[in-house]
Structures are given as C-alpha cells and as structure tokens.
C-alpha cells in the first residue's frame, strides 16, 4: 500500500526534511506550507492549523515561495537617467536600467544604483573600446593616417581621404583635403578598424606596422602638421 | 580614489639628465594619456607633452621634441618624464596629470616634483 | 600654434566682490578650454572644462562663458578661499596654457 500523504501541519520523522514548499517552524516543530510568491504569511501555522498566507499591499512583492512575515518593499521609482526594464509587481521588483548613452557605473544585486554618462572622445581622439551596459567608453589618439573630427561616444578613427593632389594635409582632427573635386580612393567606413598601437609621431617609441586599414598619406607626401587635438605647443 | 603621486626633489647639474615618474592608482591606467605640465618658479604653465601608456604613443611640444622621452610601464601603472642635456633654465616643478580624451582635460594631477639644475 | 592672452595679469579684489578673467584665443578653438585655480605650492586644479561645464565638487560660484575666440571665468561671490592663481588652456589645436591671473586681496 503506498504511503499516506502528510497534510501540513505535521510533524516530520526524525532525521528526515520538510517537503517542497514547506518549511520546519521551530515554535510549533511542525512541517507548514511556505506561502507563494506573491503573498507573505499573515498567520504562523500552529501544531493545528496551518500558515496562513495573504497578497502583498502595492509596491511591496515577494519573489519566492516564503514564509516572512512582511513583503519586500519595491525599489524607488527609476532616476530621470533611467528606464524601468521590469516594472514592480507582487511577485518581482522593480529593475531600472541606463538610458541609451549611459552605462551602470555602480550596480546592485538587479539593474543599476547609479547611472553616468558614457564618455565622448574630442577631436582627434576615437573610440577605441565602445561603452557596455557596465563599461565606459575608452578613447585613444588617433593614429598618423587616420582622424576624428567629432565630439563623440561612437565615432572611431577613420582613414584620411587619399587625394591625386592634396590641398591642406589631413592630421588627427582633420580630414585631407584635395583639390581635385573628388579623391583618387576614399577607405570604405566598414573597412575601419579601433585605433591599435602605432609609432609615435615623435619617434621615441619602437615603431610597429600602421594598421592595414589606415593607411598613411606620407608615402604621397610628408606629413602634414601636428594634429589639433593632440599638437605641439612650443615657441 | 584617483591619486597621482611623483618622484621626489632632484637637483641636477648642466648636461646632465632627469627622470621623473608619476605612479596613478585608483583607476584604470591605460584608459588615460598622461599630460606632463611644468612651472619655473614665479612663472606660468608650460605643456610639455602627453603619453598613452596603452601603446607607448606620445605627443611632444616642439620645444621639447630633441630633449624629452615619455614612457610608461603598466605593470606599475607609473608613467615616466626623462629630460636631457638639462639647462638652468630647466629649473622647475614638473607636473603629471591625467586625461581621458574626453572635454574633461586633466581632471587629476600630481603634487609635482621639484628639478633643480645648478652647477 | 594658438596663442591664448589672458587678462589681467593680476587682481586686486574683496571678499564678495564678483570678478571676471579673460582669455582670447588667437583663433577659433571651439569649445575645448578649460579653467584652472592654483595655489602656490600646489597643483592646478580643474575648475571648469568645455568652456562651460563644472568640474564635480566645484562650486556654483564659478561659470564659464565664451563669445566668439573670449572665454570668460566668472567669480559671482569671492569668498577667502578663492584668492589663488587662475590659468585658461584650450585644448582643441595642440595644447597652450595662458598667462596666468593672480587673484590678491584688496
């Protein structure tokens, strides 16, 4: 014959566990019914009667199957540089997340405490590791052969135009500008890659290869002036 | 927090060189250039160059260009200033700052270090 | 290169008082120029970047403001621990610190 099925209360053999969904009460040292998510208990179960459970008050939740006494409290509502990923309910808590151009600069157990404006690169700066949903933006030098002439969390380096006969020389903020009306090759945007290690400008670093994808306009000409963004400033 | 802390005074002779180190702690090291700044006593700020320790590029002021080196090493997270052939006019509190390459330039500084040059 | 001429050199000035410093570029720089306040025997620190943005922890006291190639660093209310030595430097071609305002005490 199979074993009778324990109605809750009841009190557990010794040694064994309570069930699923139930936990040991120590005052009454019976087995009881934890309550849903959703609800709290509003009554401990007794050696004769069991817990008895009731919906959280709005803006309070339990997640799990339990047996407090109270609902958790829902956290406060998002910050202006935030939006509301998951709303609060009785069973789950509110979660908050970085706006579109912020990232999580200090985060809690869900979503995000604190919230910060994802870095721009000036002129003459490129993005060389994109912001995350809990990183920053990176920025580097642009690289000789490459510029970027913008203020911002996006925009990489991109290669000077190549020209059939140059106007100004491009530098790191600054395009090349040809006086041709078009430029003999221009390197396609897709074809762009972060900015990567490359001899200095003045010469006091071991030189290594300018990235494929970049190429210098030096080998058409000399190089142009020293970059806006990153210049020379001497008398 | 974000600190930068220099080298300690020197005092040099003419022709001879200095090195000046600048080790940063309390955030990312090679997320920055690191800006070297000098000030003569009495006198005003004078930019010297920058460093990006990620890959050792550098940019230098042309009056600077013959006679300084900026290295970095980021085991150490430090940066490095060595000026050569030094003069007496090379008499200066030499600064490290940081920069992110954002509109916000050099938020952090060194104390400074103190390099005099006298025979 | 940009030349950046501040003015005045110096400053004479009381406690409430409001006070403004000038720069001027020698040519166009954008936005990118900043304000430091040194005291003597320490390091500059950032005031104001970007010409108009407040470094964290600065007070309110300080502003910035540009027309055209003149960026202005205003003082709206001194207080004691704002005489000290104030430097502009523009960072968008190259990299040039002006000349410097030395803020005394009348």
């Known amino acids: 014959l199979p074993a009778q099925v324990a109605f809750t209360p009841y009190a557990p053999e010794p040694g064994s566990t309570c069930r699923l969904r139930e936990y040991y009460d120590q005052t009454a040292q019976m087995c009881c019914s934890k309550c849903s998510p959703g609800q709290h208990a509003k009554v401990f179960c007794t050696k004769t009667s069991d817990t008895v459970c009731d919906s959280c008050e709005d803006s309070t939740y339990t997640q799990l199957w339990n047996w407090v006494p109270e609902c958790l409290s829902c956290g406060s509502r998002c910050s202006s540089d935030q939006v509301e990923t998951q709303a609060c309910t009785r069973e789950q808590n509110r979660i908050c997340t970085c706006r579109p151009g912020w990232y999580c600069a200090l985060s809690k157990q869900e979503g995000c405490r604190l919230c910060a404006p994802l870095r721009k690169c000036r002129p003459g700066f490129g993005v060389a590791r994109p912001g995350t949903e809990t990183s920053d933006v990176v920025c580097k030098p642009c690289a000789p052969g490459t510029f970027s002439n913008t203020t911002s969390s996006t925009d990489i380096c991109r290669p000077h135009q190549i020209c059939n006969v140059v106007a100004i020389p491009g530098n790191a903020s600054m395009d090349a500008v040809c006086t041709s009306t078009s430029p003999t090759r221009s390197m396609a945007p897709g074809a762009v890659h972060l900015p990567q290690p490359v001899s200095t400008r003045s010469q006091h670093t071991q030189p290594t290869p300018e990235p494929s994808t970049a190429p210098s306009t030096s080998f058409l000409l000399p190089m142009g002036p020293s970059p806006p963004a990153e210049g020379s400033t001497g008398d | 927090q974000v600190q930068l802390v220099q080298s300690g005074a020197e005092v040099k002779k003419p022709g001879a060189s200095v090195k000046v180190s600048c080790k940063a702690s309390g955030y990312t090291f090679t997320d920055y250039i690191i800006h070297w700044v000098r000030q003569a006593p009495g006198q005003g700020l004078e930019w010297m160059g920058w460093?990006?320790?990620?890959?050792?590029?550098?940019d230098y002021a042309d009056k600077f260009k013959k006679r300084v080196t900026m290295t970095a090493d980021t085991s150490i997270s430090t940066a490095f200033m060595e000026l050569s052939r030094l003069r007496s006019d090379d008499t200066a509190v030499y600064y490290c700052?940081?920069?992110?390459?954002?509109?916000?330039?050099?938020?952090?500084w060194g104390q400074g270090t103190l390099v005099t040059v006298s025979s | 290169d940009i030349q950046m001429t501040q003015s005045p050199s110096s400053l004479s000035a009381s406690v409430g008082d409001r006070v403004t410093i000038t720069c001027q570029g020698s040519q166009n720089i954008d936005n990118y120029l900043a304000w430091f306040q040194q005291k003597p025997g320490k390091a500059p620190k950032l005031l104001i970047y970007?010409?108009?943005s407040l470094q964290t922890g600065v007070p309110s006291r300080f502003s910035g403001s540009r027309s055209g190639t003149d960026f202005t660093l205003t003082i709206s209310s001194l207080q004691p621990e704002d005489f000290a030595t104030y430097f502009c430097?523009?960072?968008?071609?190259?990299?040039?610190f002006g000349g410097g305002t030395k803020l005394e005490l009348k």
């Open positions: 700052a940081r920069d992110d390459a954002s509109p916000l330039v050099m938020d952090a």
């Open positions: 460093i990006d320790p990620d890959y050792g590029n550098t």
């Open positions: 970007s010409t108009y």
């Open positions: 430097f523009q960072y968008n071609q190259g990299y040039m």
